[in-house]
């Protein structure tokens, strides 16, 4: 049950009050509002609307709301110069080109400034060659392709199909393939779900649609040129050769009308087995190069897109509390887009305004919330999570003293058929009592709770009765306050079913085709959806902020912590031989665990029975439960990654978006059996199991009896 | 500054055929997706027919069967080619192409009536 403990509390200054107050009405005003024009990071649109959502939020009632601006690394097509991919034949003439733009949906016809498909951080450079069909790009498409195949990439320029992982990934995978060019897809069996029209009659993308993004591997840096430090005014910059994560070669994204142009000519090896073809009528050839008749056709991309310094602009406002000033609770989410941003963020961004105005409308009634609540609209997130990585880093020292849980608000919806929840452990509690006390929106459901229906649709794999939480990853706003930070952190939005819809997030996911009718006609039209994600977000974000012993639970982690000990050995005892030649042992890892869970258990029993109206008691139990997870971070960093910090996640090394248990040790072991140097290797698997077992100990320390 | 000069249209007889140009003076919209839109007396505008830089082509249900398009690359023009024409295919056309912002032809007019 919500506790409804802040002062000046009145019986209607509670949860309830809050909830009460969030209205699906008020959301839909507000993403119509957000989604009109493009509001593309470092435009002039973008900062307006920075200015608009500053005021809005001053009217709502937060005690104060500032522009916190950095000048960081961004990247532009040139509009002189376009970007596009040819065929050309033996003479040099180019007898196929790719579209430049996205024909507009209906009613954006005159909307200027829409910027085209591109891939952000490309360099410049007009390869040609042959091309290799690649798959998803993903590690193991290119063990098979390398290893079985035997085909080398080697001054190739692949063809890739979106999914399964962070774009970033694939173009990492294609450079140290030795690839000179990148060309990006997305396939209709990843975009494209059966019995669904294509936009504007449906949701599915259509043949001229193209998904943007950013290609960078900056595993957590921030802006590319002030790694580590904000981009301020008096900021030392790198020189664009040492920035960190940009890709060494040309990278660019096409629909697959044009993709079937390419692909249909594709001669060379045919695909490994089924997993390799997609929907489209073309055999999936692996090349290299095109077939018979067009064996002396190439391929060319032109590219001539920019990276410029630019000014972006995050909105902060703060709700200062009244008992515990000091102690921070953030909901985060950005404002940048694409380009409408119909779902990506402005369902999210819509959803926070939502917020602000009900606890600003509790405020106005004399109420305050217990802790201090921040709110942030972050820039330049699609450009690396840019706005949020740098108020971090401008903020570091206060945040990991006073940062409570961070709770992320993007995309409020990736389709309409349950609740997904990924977080820190030490929410689950949280999360199911919450959820239990909420009604569900779902068809079916009605009259009964949130938890149930998506208990129902979601069950998790390893508890009956109760649902999937999965872990954090990253490609948000989350990343520096969880992976480098070690502050808790969640994100909570309604997703699709993903037993019968295997297509690879939403279809028209950084398309032109993501606008406000989008969402108002196909995927949410009462905006009950976006409501239940409201009452999620706001309703964690209240609780933590407002009950008098923080809702963490810590047992829950030493659940996790053993089950994820249990996986990596699991996977080391895939070479039981190697673990007997080199002395290998889970035994410290397995023992620390033990340790921590019965010292959580211990503190567990403390924190019911300790005198909870002597303050100084109180707080000292609250700061063991808001530095427990800042316990996981090692000051080191992992291997070659120094900005993911947490020894217990981190996002997987193969793909941005997912996260990964023990990333140490994961790391350490994959791909063992291919080491040049075997001893060297598992070296490094001890090191890493040694840094675990000695991060978990240090973490249940502190939750030990302080003297 | 770039140009969409649209030529064709006129009075036809139902059953009967026309059809329309439009020559742009742009080189990059010879790499660039090119519509047929039309608007017909005290209705919204509709999308006709779509063609991208590689010749793939869309169109509307209302026209699919008896409109093509198609584009000549080497003169910068486009062309719809308007078969059985019927009543309901009166209203003025335009070409339109896209590029950071709308570029519209200056429109055609046609007319299908016996």
């Known amino acids: 049950k919500s506790s409804n403990e802040a002062t000046n509390i009145t019986p209607k200054h509670n949860m309830k009050a809050f909830l009460d107050e969030l209205k699906a009405e008020n959301i839909k005003k507000f993403l119509y509002n957000f989604t009109q024009i493009p509001h593309l990071a470092g435009t002039e649109q973008n900062f307006q609307l920075a200015k608009q959502i500053q005021s809005q939020w001053k009217e709502f009632g937060l005690d104060s709301v500032e522009l916190a601006h950095y000048d960081v690394l961004l990247s532009y097509p040139n509009k002189t110069h376009p970007n596009y991919i040819s065929i050309i034949n033996e003479d040099g003439n180019e007898i196929f080109n790719t579209s430049l733009f996205e024909p507009p949906p209906p009613g954006y016809e005159n909307v200027s400034d829409i910027v085209p498909p591109f891939s952000a951080f490309s360099p410049q450079g007009m390869p040609e060659g042959d091309l290799v069909y690649v798959n998803y790009a993903r590690t193991e498409d290119f063990f098979k392709l390398e290893r079985d195949m035997k085909i080398n990439c080697s001054g190739k320029i692949v063809i890739a199909r979106y999914g399964k992982v962070f774009r970033g990934n694939k173009v990492k995978n294609a450079q140290l393939a030795g690839a000179k060019g990148v060309i990006l897809y997305s396939d209709p069996a990843d975009y494209f779900a059966p019995g669904v029209k294509s936009y504007p009659d449906g949701w599915n993308l259509p043949g001229g649609g193209v998904q943007r993004g950013n290609i960078l591997n900056l595993n957590g840096a921030g802006d590319p040129l002030t790694p580590g430090y904000p981009a301020n005014e008096y900021a030392y910059r790198r020189g664009i050769a040492e920035a960190v994560g940009l890709p060494s070669i040309p990278v660019h994204p096409i629909g697959y009308y044009d993709a079937q142009k390419l692909l249909e000519k594709m001669g060379g090896s045919a695909p490994p087995d089924s997993s390799w073809r997609g929907s489209l009528k073309v055999p999936y050839n692996v090349g290299p190069g095109f077939t018979g008749n067009f064996s002396t056709q190439k391929v060319k991309m032109h590219i001539h897109s920019t990276n410029e310094v630019t000014r972006i602009y995050n909105v902060i406002g703060t709700l200062r509390g009244a008992v515990e000033p000091d102690r921070y609770v953030i909901l985060g989410g950005h404002r940048d887009s694409w380009v409408f941003g119909g779902i990506d963020p402005q369902s999210g961004a819509a959803v926070v305004h939502e917020i602000v105005r009900s606890f600003g409308t509790l405020k106005k009634e004399g109420w305050r919330p217990r802790r201090t609540i921040l709110f942030a609209s972050w820039d330049a997130e699609e450009f690396g999570l840019l706005g949020s990585t740098e108020w971090a880093e401008e903020n570091s020292r206060l945040l990991q003293e006073r940062g409570v849980a961070y709770i992320n608000a993007d995309s409020s919806i990736e389709g309409n058929y349950t609740l997904r929840v990924d977080c820190t452990p030490l929410m689950y509690s949280l999360v199911h009592n919450l959820t239990k006390e909420l009604k569900s929106p779902d068809e079916g459901f009605e009259g009964k709770s949130l938890y149930e229906s998506w208990t129902k649709k979601s069950p998790s794999p390893e508890f009956s009765g109760m649902p999937r939480i999965s872990k954090l990853g990253s490609g948000n706003d989350f990343e520096v306050f969880f992976q480098r930070l070690g502050i808790a952190s969640g994100r909570a939005r309604y997703t699709k079913n993903w037993e019968t819809n295997k297509f690879s997030g939403y279809p028209l996911y950084h398309s032109v085709y993501e606008t406000y009718e989008l969402v108002e006609k196909f995927y949410d039209p009462m905006f009950k959806y976006h409501l239940t994600v409201a009452q999620v977000r706001g309703g964690m974000v209240f609780e933590l902020a407002n009950s008098i012993v923080l809702p963490f639970d810590c047992r829950d982690y030493a659940v996790v912590l053993r089950k994820y000990a249990d996986k990596i050995y699991s996977i080391s005892m895939k070479h039981p031989q190697e673990m007997k030649t080199y002395s290998v042992s889970f035994d410290s890892l397995f023992s620390a665990v033990k340790n921590f869970t019965e010292i959580a258990s211990k503190f567990s029993e403390r924190l019911q029975d300790f005198d909870k109206s002597n303050p100084i008691v109180l707080r000292m139990m609250n700061d063991q439960l808001m530095f427990l997870e800042r316990a996981f971070i090692d000051p080191l960093g992992l291997p070659d990654r120094p900005f993911y910090r947490h020894v217990i996640y981190a996002p997987s090394s193969h793909n941005k978006y997912a996260g990964e248990s023990f990333p140490g040790i994961y790391d350490a072991l994959f791909d063992i059996e291919s080491k040049v140097d075997p001893s060297k290797a598992w070296g490094e698997v001890k090191r890493q199991i040694y840094v675990a077992a000695f991060t978990v100990q240090a973490a249940a320390e502190t939750l030990s009896e302080v003297a | 500054q770039v140009q969409l000069q649209q030529s064709g249209g006129g009075l036809v007889q139902p059953g009967g055929s026309l059809r329309l140009s439009c020559a742009d003076s742009g080189s990059i919209f010879r790499i660039n997706t090119m519509h047929w839109y039309r608007q017909a007396p005290g209705k919204q505008r509709e999308l006709v027919a779509t063609?991208?830089?590689?010749?793939?082509?869309n169109y509307a249900d209302s026209v699919k069967g008896r409109f093509t398009i198609s584009r000549d690359n080497t003169k910068n023009t486009m062309y719809l080619q308007m078969n059985s024409l019927k009543a309901e295919d009166t209203a003025v056309y335009y070409c339109?192409?896209?590029?950071?912002?709308?570029?519209w032809g200056q429109g055609t007019q046609v007319t299908v009536s016996s």
């Open positions: 339109y192409t896209y590029y950071y912002r709308a570029y």
């Open positions: 063609i991208t830089s590689g010749g793939s082509t």
